[in-house]
């Protein structure tokens, strides 16, 4: 009837609403966002769709071409003047590829009730989607009430007559989903109870979270969980040359979006990242750490020839110390102490110097004193020995002084100021010093120990001995006191510059108590211990020279 | 004090094989890129190959690549070049050099040089 | 590969006065604020001999009469007051990408 606005005007040919329809339709119909993946689009079939219809008479397929010949598959129905109308389109089996969710966005048109004049009564605005789980691609003969409603599709948008006449379309799309789905696959349905409806296209989708690289770390296209509220936590691998202290980990939402991004993974050492991916490190620079972000140039005096990596190489006389971290210069022991000067009091000595020209570009210098006791005839040094002490001490210092105290008095002592740093003992070299030649001041001398009895006679007594073992300077003579046996507080005193004396005018046979001691110009030592020797009776010989104990 | 000096140099026939050493003093030989550079007489220098201290990288001038093989035996302080394959135009002198270790890097140190000479 | 490119492929100059010899690259030699360029002197039937690193460092043991500058991908040594010993072949080298190329060699000659 004419009512219809030409849908039926011929047998198999599509109504000029259909035409102008498709012409608008194929100027909208974009590609699919990459988080969608098409289990079904009608639009991209190219040949037979495969769907089937019952009754027969009810929807249609409207065979039309696009701009390229493809054909474009649209059904339609529109028996709205006809009562208890109940028209299925059933799809061909749809594979879920393991998705638990999908989509179907319908592109359709529907005709204004309204506007079509007596068919009021039985004219619908709406049609059904239904859908039916299998596992059989051919498990189509089922009958309705197997099927499960998705929805009632109304149109957002239906036209009229004059719509028509101004060759203006009015698209409608409509998006549902349903889930959970547990079969490898389903069918859908569309129910047209009365209405006047094209319907353009079908896209069957369900959503994934698309591969993605994030922080170094691959997530795998990932599809989307069955709940609308769902995140899926999603592991994901670093990249080549990259390492993780905490698995990268993100979660996928339900609309196909990644989220909540936890842990992350970073280019190993000698690598760095460049454009999502760890590249190496280049000769000439190095990368520690994984926590480092980038290569970074080799320190000073230090290279490296190779590709990744994670230390360079120190040059030719130059040293790093296990504790150095790898980002520091390479260094070297210091250049000697400067200007070093010399302060003698009595047996002590202080030394003062200035720092090395060169620290070997460490702050870690400080100064070791060596000491040599030097005999000036022979030329020949010996260590000085424990007895010396040093303040603040001898190794290790600090600063740029030292005091030497319990030094031998008028002794030559040459002492060797190093400088050393944190790799002085990594460097093979020479040690690096500044000497100081100093003299101790004279003291008084330490007392005579070996004294010889030479000839003894009934008046006299002759003596000698050795100069003190600890001179402390230049003996200018020797004073001999001596005294008759308990008879201390009369004493005699003899003085002589030589290392003989003989006492005169003593009382035969009678013990006489000798004590020597010496004088420099710091003054006199102390005396010696009491030797005692006896003179001859008046009628004995003279005795032999002996060593007294 | 660093020297470099290269051996094994001669006349070989074309499609014929030779292999080039140079022997390294002075210096840590292990932490050093070698490279071989060579000079076709009356010409001017050509890069042909360079090969990491550790021998972990290892690079070639495409005029050589197939042919050459650069190899190190950082044991006995010495670079190889085993050359297969000889055309007349591998004809040259032939140098090793040292990369140098002040950045960015240039061959500081060179041999003398070992001249091959490829003909019939 | 870099193609490098020297210019002029010969000059003279009187001693004491100043030579100055380009090279140009096909591409830029530059890396993180570096330029990896080589400048290098060979005199007949010796081996090359390092002048100048980085487009412009002075190599130790050379006068610093030769000088270097330039970046990207031109590159320029001079000499300031030429020496009767400066007469020899003058080559630059990229050391920025694999393989290593070397210009064709500048010839200078003392007038």
């Known amino acids: 009837p004419a009512s219809l606005a030409g849908c039926y005007s011929a047998p198999r040919r599509a109504p000029l609403w259909t035409c102008l329809l498709l012409c608008a339709a194929l100027r909208t119909l974009l590609a699919s966002p990459s988080n969608e993946v098409n289990l079904l689009d009608s639009r991209t079939v190219m040949g037979d769709l495969g769907w089937i219809a019952f009754p027969k008479n009810g929807w249609e397929e409207i065979g039309e071409v696009d701009e390229n010949y493809a054909p474009i598959h649209t059904y339609q129905v529109c028996k709205v003047m006809e009562q208890n109308q109940n028209n299925w389109l059933l799809t061909s089996w749809i594979s879920n590829e393991g998705a638990s969710r999908i989509f179907i966005e319908l592109k359709f048109t529907l005709r204004d009730c309204n506007s079509l004049p007596g068919g009021l009564g039985t004219c619908k605005e709406t049609f059904n989607m239904y859908y039916f789980e299998s596992d059989d691609q051919n498990g189509r003969n089922i009958k309705e009430n197997q099927y499960i409603k998705i929805d009632t599709i109304a149109a957002d948008e239906s036209f009229t007559e004059l719509d028509l006449g101004d060759r203006v379309m009015k698209l409608n799309t409509e998006v549902r989903d349903v889930g959970p789905l547990s079969k490898k696959g389903f069918y859908l349905a569309f129910q047209d109870v009365g209405a006047c409806i094209a319907l353009v296209s079908v896209r069957v989708y369900y959503k994934k979270c698309p591969s993605v690289v994030r922080h170094l770390a691959v997530f795998p296209d990932t599809i989307t969980g069955a709940d609308s509220s769902q995140l899926l936590e999603v592991s994901g691998s670093c990249v080549n040359h990259s390492v993780t202290d905490e698995p990268p980990k993100m979660h996928c939402s339900a609309e196909g979006e990644w989220l909540v991004p936890i842990g992350k993974c970073m280019c190993k050492a000698g690598y760095e990242e460049k454009n999502g991916t760890c590249q190496v490190c280049r000769p000439g620079f190095f990368k520690a750490s994984p926590h480092i972000q980038s290569c970074g140039k080799c320190p000073p005096h230090s290279y490296t020839h190779e590709e990744a990596s994670t230390s360079c190489v120190c040059e030719k006389d130059y040293f790093r110390r296990e504790s150095d971290p790898p980002t520091m210069a390479c260094t070297r022991p210091p250049s000697a102490p400067r200007n070093a000067i010399s302060n003698v009091n009595e047996t002590s000595v202080f030394l003062e110097w200035i720092p090395p020209a060169d620290t070997g570009g460490r702050k870690d210098v400080s100064y070791y004193i060596a000491c040599k006791k030097c005999n000036s005839h022979a030329g020949v040094c010996e260590e000085c020995g424990g007895h010396v002490r040093y303040l603040p001490r001898q190794s290790g210092l600090k600063n740029t002084s030292v005091m030497m105290v319990d030094l031998l008095a008028h002794t030559n002592y040459t002492f060797e100021i190093e400088a050393v740093n944190g790799v002085s003992d990594l460097s093979p070299g020479a040690r690096q010093y500044v000497s100081v030649n100093v003299t101790t001041n004279q003291a008084a001398p330490s007392p005579v120990t070996n004294v010889k009895k030479g000839k003894i006679a009934k008046n006299s007594i002759s003596l000698s001995w050795q100069e003190p073992d600890r001179p402390n300077g230049i003996i200018l003579e020797y004073e001999i006191k001596y005294f008759e046996k308990d008879q201390e507080t009369s004493y005699t005193i003899i003085k002589s510059k030589e290392t003989t004396i003989t006492a005169e005018g003593l009382k035969p046979a009678s013990v006489y108590v000798f004590q020597i001691r010496a004088r420099t110009a710091a003054g006199y030592g102390v005396f010696s211990r009491r030797f005692e020797f006896e003179t001859t009776p008046v009628f004995a010989a003279s005795s032999d020279q002996s060593q007294i104990p | 004090e660093v020297q470099l000096v290269e051996s094994g140099g001669g006349l070989v026939q074309p499609g014929g094989s030779l292999k080039l050493s140079c022997a390294a003093s002075?210096?840590?030989?292990?932490?050093?890129?070698i490279h071989w550079v060579r000079q076709a007489p009356g010409k001017g220098l050509e890069w042909v190959a360079s090969?990491?201290?550790?021998?972990?990288?290892?690079y070639y001038a495409d005029s050589v690549k197939g042919r050459f093989t650069i190899s190190r035996d950082n044991s006995k302080n010495t670079l190889y070049l085993q050359m297969n394959s000889l055309r007349a135009e591998d004809t040259a002198v032939y140098y090793c050099?040292?990369?140098?270790?002040?950045?960015?890097?240039?061959?500081?140190?060179w041999g003398q040089g070992t001249l091959v000479t490829v003909s019939s | 590969d870099i193609v490098m490119t020297q210019s002029p492929d010969s000059l003279a100059v009187s001693l004491g006065e100043r030579a100055t010899i380009n090279c140009k690259s096909s591409?830029?030699?530059?890396?993180?604020?570096?330029?990896?360029m080589n400048w290098y002197q060979q005199k007949p039937g010796k081996a090359p001999k390092l002048l100048i690193y980085?487009?412009?460092n002075l190599e130790s043991g050379i006068p610093d009469r030769f000088s270097g500058s330039g970046s990207g991908t031109d590159f320029t040594l001079t000499i300031s007051r030429l020496e009767p010993e400066d007469a020899a072949v003058y080559y630059c080298?990229?050391?920025?990408?694999?393989?290593?190329?070397f210009g064709q060699g500048t010839k200078l000659e003392i007038k």
């Open positions: 090969i990491s201290g550790a021998s972990t990288t290892i």
């Open positions: 591409q830029s030699v530059d890396y993180d604020g570096d330029s990896y």
């Open positions: 080298q990229q050391s920025n990408e694999d393989p290593f190329t």
């Open positions: 980085g487009a412009s």
């Open positions: 050099a040292r990369y140098g270790t002040s950045f960015p890097y240039g061959l500081d140190y």
């Open positions: 002075g210096f840590t030989f292990s932490t050093f890129g």
